[in-house]
């Protein structure tokens, strides 16, 4: 019996087609992805093959203005239109709190939404009961397939799930649910979830009875043969993990942003043994036409976005200096504003010992592309912010050793004075450079804001200590020559859309007046 698994993950609000790098589509003939194109391919496969499941491994939420405006209603609407069979909850599904998940998505989705390792407690337990499930048994042709969901246990540090959801260890939570499916005589089981490739592999290795793992969160690109676009494969598709008891378990993921449709064919015998598995992600490029009815629907929903772009988010009473002449040479108040917004967006998980889990931000000056003039009645719009941050990136959370941070700050000024983009803007950091010294030895003082303290204060950076830092995904991926960050980071979790972070902060503050205050000397 053959099953075709179609899968997406980390789509992050890319409802419309995008450019090859998943930013805004400029030249339509070169654009990729989008739900209209995805629907064409899915329907083509559904017509050609008998047993097809369309699955999503989480993080549909967050990433473009679509989510900012529609807050998840767009996810439910278009996933329903594409007739997804199941979805696992990702960490970003909690970005607008539990209410922001329940109302727009859980109550509106016509497909099961799954997570076995999220347990509701207190008043939320009855409110959310039945709206998401640990597993679902789906009829496929003459057979049944069990889908069991999971979500990153780091979600409380990455999003806003509140205090009434407990995120358990994935493996501990999955095993009893898989055992339950086994007692129900379900012998074909897919683990669908959002914890990253390393955890996906661990689930394949440790959770007895799981036949296939369909994952997300780490934006992992797997491919067998010559890859069709710019993404470099992290391994073969499917990636085969040998479980502790000797089962050969295919693990798949389909990069991100709806650029690819994962396509996996699994052959089962009558006992549910996986006899063979093969496939590859399908690049959703312009050779696949956009479905006209879905495209028309997208265009209808688009109208509200254009209106939103010009609405006032808040006001500034000072000039927001985002000029390259400032931000690539010295501390600029636009850099301070953005870093403050980045930290504010990550205010969560305080306890008796920590006022927050993260206090530091770094931001390449070259990523700030425009100033905002306060003389336009002080008005700040989404459109203004899109000019400042035009690349459609995310502000991510990483863990780095102090020694890596020191290298990053040396790199920041290694060729100072040439208007290059690597000059770092900061938050929660005081750095002093001596530019008379030779490159690689110019950082003379580096103090960082404590987190394990009731009154935040600046302490000298410790080389062997591990620090959490918020930074653009561009830097986490080694952009602007920050290879040391990419090579030495100990953990990397993707965060929220850059413009969305700043716009939320401005809306919250209502009136802003960031200053140059001696963070960089």
């Amino acid at each position: 019996w053959e099953l075709t698994i179609l899968h997406t993950n980390d789509v992050h609000s890319r409802l419309e087609q995008t450019s090859e790098d998943s930013s805004k589509c400029v030249n339509a003939s070169r654009c990729m992805g989008g739900v209209a194109r995805l629907f064409t391919k899915v329907q083509q496969i559904r017509r050609a093959e008998p047993n097809v499941l369309l699955l999503d491994a989480g993080d549909q939420y967050q990433g473009t203005i679509w989510f900012t405006v529609y807050k998840g209603a767009e996810v439910a609407h278009f996933m329903n239109a594409l007739r997804y069979d199941a979805m696992a909850l990702g960490n970003h599904e909690f970005d607008n709190g539990v209410e922001g998940l329940i109302e727009p998505l859980l109550k509106e989705a016509k497909f099961p939404i799954l997570s076995a390792n999220i347990k509701a407690k207190g008043p939320l337990a009855s409110q959310i009961s039945g709206l998401y499930l640990p597993y679902k048994v789906l009829p496929v042709g003459d057979e049944v397939v069990g889908i069991v969901g999971y979500t990153s246990k780091e979600t409380p540090f990455l999003s806003n799930p509140g205090t009434n959801l407990v995120f358990e260890d994935e493996i501990t939570a999955l095993q009893p649910e898989v055992d339950k499916l086994k007692t129900l005589n379900v012998n074909k089981i897919i683990a669908l979830g959002h914890s990253g490739f390393e955890t996906d592999k661990l689930i394949a290795q440790k959770v007895r009875g799981v036949d296939v793992v369909v994952g997300g969160h780490s934006n992992t690109f797997l491919y067998t043969g010559n890859p069709p676009s710019k993404e470099v494969p992290a391994g073969k598709y499917p990636f085969i993990v040998t479980s502790d008891d000797g089962r050969k378990v295919p693990v798949v993921q389909a990069y991100a942003f709806g650029k690819y449709l994962g396509y996996l064919k699994i052959e089962f015998d009558e006992r549910g043994n996986v006899i063979s598995s093969h496939g590859n992600p399908i690049l959703l490029n312009s050779s696949i036409p956009e479905d006209p009815s879905i495209k028309a629907d997208i265009n209808k929903w688009r109208i509200k976005l254009d209106n939103y772009s010009t609405q006032e988010l808040g006001k500034t009473i000072v000039y927001l200096d985002g000029s390259s002449q400032s931000c690539r040479f010295r501390e600029c108040n636009m850099g301070n504003l953005i870093c403050d917004a980045m930290i504010n967006n990550n205010l969560r998980h305080a306890d008796e010992m920590f006022w927050n889990h993260v206090s530091m931000c770094i931001l390449n000056g070259g990523g700030i592309r425009s100033p905002i003039d306060e003389r336009n009645n002080g008005t700040i719009t989404w459109e203004n912010l899109a000019a400042v941050l035009p690349f459609g990136g995310t502000f991510d959370l990483v863990q780095l050793k102090g020694s890596t941070l020191k290298k990053a700050f040396e790199h920041s000024v290694h060729r100072y004075g040439q208007s290059t983009g690597e000059f770092l803007q900061v938050g929660g950091i005081h750095v002093v450079y001596d530019l008379s010294r030779k490159p690689g030895d110019r950082v003379v003082k580096l103090d960082v804001l404590c987190t394990k303290c009731r009154v935040p204060s600046y302490d000298p950076l410790k080389m062997d200590e591990i620090y959490k830092v918020i930074l653009p995904n561009f830097l986490a991926n080694g952009g602007d020559g920050f290879q040391m960050i990419k090579d030495e980071l100990l953990r990397h979790d993707s965060g929220d859309q850059d413009i969305n972070v700043v716009s939320t902060y401005i809306s919250k503050m209502k009136v802003i007046y960031p200053a140059v205050e001696g963070r960089i000397k």
Partner: antibody
């Protein structure tokens, strides 16, 4: 239907080696583990080890590590077990069987090969 | 390694009898218990997997039960062709291990 054809009886001297074969038919050879089981006369069954022909992954019980070598030839759908440094206690019937990994049961068995170790 | 113990090494019963053969594991094996029949000619067949699931083609007079460490195989209406030795095997943890066997004879 699924079947295993095992090689004929072997007579070997102590210290010698034997190589037993098990030819599979009626199923996808590369999709299942082949298990090897020993039974001494009048005794119970003892698991030796297993091979997954799809990638030549092997597992052995501690007692047979280093002395049993499992191999598989996918072109002929045949699994082999070589047993070296034979002693009288290796005189037994050796079975190959197909392993189901949902419950790790052995659902189809060969008829067995008798090995006699004698000087 | 998990030890599998079949305390009764041989059992006599009459045709038509209900016969129960037991098997004990040295630790919890989470229902991953399989039963085999070995005929006097050496032929081995799977009867039951995962404690109670009848393998295809096996007569319905065979049934299995148990949990944790204690398991049993029942033949509800003994027939002549059931004369054989019965082995249990755990599929919970490598290495897979078998019980010593229970030989069933006719009274």
């Amino acid at each position: 239907q699924v079947q295993f054809q095992q090689s004929g009886a072997e007579l070997a001297r102590p210290g010698a080696s034997v190589k037993l074969s098990c030819k599979a038919s009626g199923y996808t050879f590369t999709g299942y583990w082949i298990q090897w089981v020993k039974q001494r006369p009048g005794q119970g069954l003892e698991w030796i080890g297993a091979i997954y022909p799809g990638d030549d992954d092997t597992r052995y019980t501690q007692k047979f590590k280093g002395r049993a070598t499992l191999t598989a030839d996918t072109s002929s759908s045949t699994a082999y077990m070589q047993l070296s440094s034979l002693a009288s206690e290796d005189s037994a019937v050796y079975y190959c069987a197909r392993g189901n990994w949902d419950d790790w049961d052995f659902d189809v068995w060969g008829a067995g090969t008798t090995v006699t170790v004698s000087s | 390694d998990i030890q599998m113990t079949q305390t009764t090494s041989s059992l006599s019963a009459s045709l038509g009898d209900r016969v129960t053969i037991s098997c004990r594991a040295s630790q919890d094996i989470s229902n991953y218990l399989n039963w085999y029949q070995q005929k006097p000619d050496g032929t081995v067949k799977l009867l039951i997997h995962y404690t109670s699931r009848l393998h295809s083609g096996v007569p319905s007079r065979f049934s299995g039960s148990g949990s944790g460490t204690d398991y049993s195989l029942t033949i509800s209406n003994l027939e002549q062709e059931d004369i054989a030795t019965y082995f249990c095997q755990q599929g919970d943890t490598l290495p897979w291990t078998f019980g010593g066997g229970t030989k069933l004879e006719i009274k």
